[in-house]
Interface confidence: low
Amino acid sequence: MNSFSTSAFGPVAFSLGLLLVLPAAFPAPVPPGEDSKDVAAPHRQPLTSSERIDKQIRYILDGISALRKETCNKSNMCESSKEALAENNLNLPKMAEKDGCFQSGFNEETCLVKIITGLLEFEVYLEYLQNRFESSEEQARAVQMSTKVLIQFLQKKAKNLDAITTPDPTTNASLLTKLQAQNQWLQDMTTHLILRSFKEFLQSSLRALRQM
């Protein structure tokens, strides 16, 4: 097997258990809504839209795990009981009963709108995470970029795009400035809370999307 050697940062090794690592003939799934007439998939069928979204979320979750590892190693935020103090200042997206994503009262369309809206709201917080990591700089970028791709996939799946509210750029810009102006302890806490909340949001999304 030919191995690629890495330069610059360590490899972005978000190991996905389901990845096929084939030295010679890589399969070639095609994302939803994109035709690939040129690529042959010799060993298996292209991924369906749902499978692709599922894998994309798990890929992001692996990235979050890598970032959380650095955060927890760097500070004691992961054991801190003062989270509530900082959490009050953050308006991080959360799943609620009314969003239709839980088993009781499940509503596919309402839930999908919530997932997309929530991801769009998380984007400013993911922007904040950039420059917050030393050894995991590329993981932080990967989580941000992969979330953008996930949003694109989900928007293709959604029928009711009008119901999706996009965050106001001016509000986001001032929020970002405010977050970056916090003292070091609050910045560390904010980083920890963003990662934890985003992980929980994605896990809830993953469960809901598997029912769709």
Epitope: T6, P11, F14, L19, P29, V39, E138, R141
Partner: nanobody, 128 residues
């Protein structure tokens, strides 16, 4: 429509250089890893190099390490493969692929993650 178009191939003498280009369109280059593969007649496809999205971590096959350099220009939506000190065994059809993911693969082993688009390729012949 997503497209990858390679160019820059040709005939070169051993020890010579070539610069391959992979022009991408229909998607944002910074969101995806781009890899170069090659396939020589009668041989298996081989991963040559890969560059991950945005920050641009690079990976190289052992056979080309120190001779080939991959780079990207997000503004031009193009990835380049600079090939120096070319050898007869580098003769192959070279093509670029877009990874389904942002990074190049599991711990940089081959392209690792599935790719979803590839170009038609550009032929490189190293011969005296």
């Amino acid at each position: 429509e997503v497209q990858l178009v390679e160019s820059g191939g040709g005939v070169v003498q051993p020890g010579g250089s070539l610069r391959l280009s992979c022009a991408a369109s229909g998607f944002t280059l910074a969101y995806y890893a781009i890899g170069w593969f090659r396939q020589a007649p009668g041989k298996e496809r081989e991963g040559v190099s890969c560059i991950s999205g945005s920050v641009g971590t690079t990976y190289y096959a052992d056979s080309v390490k120190g001779r080939f350099t991959i780079s990207r220009d997000n503004a031009k939506n193009t990835v380049y493969l600079q090939m120096n000190s070319l050898r007869p065994e580098d003769t192959a059809l070279y093509y670029c692929v877009r990874s389904s993911w942002f990074d190049c693969g599991v711990q940089g082993r081959d392209l690792g993650n599935e790719y979803d688009y590839r170009g038609q390729g550009t032929l490189v012949t190293v011969s005296s």
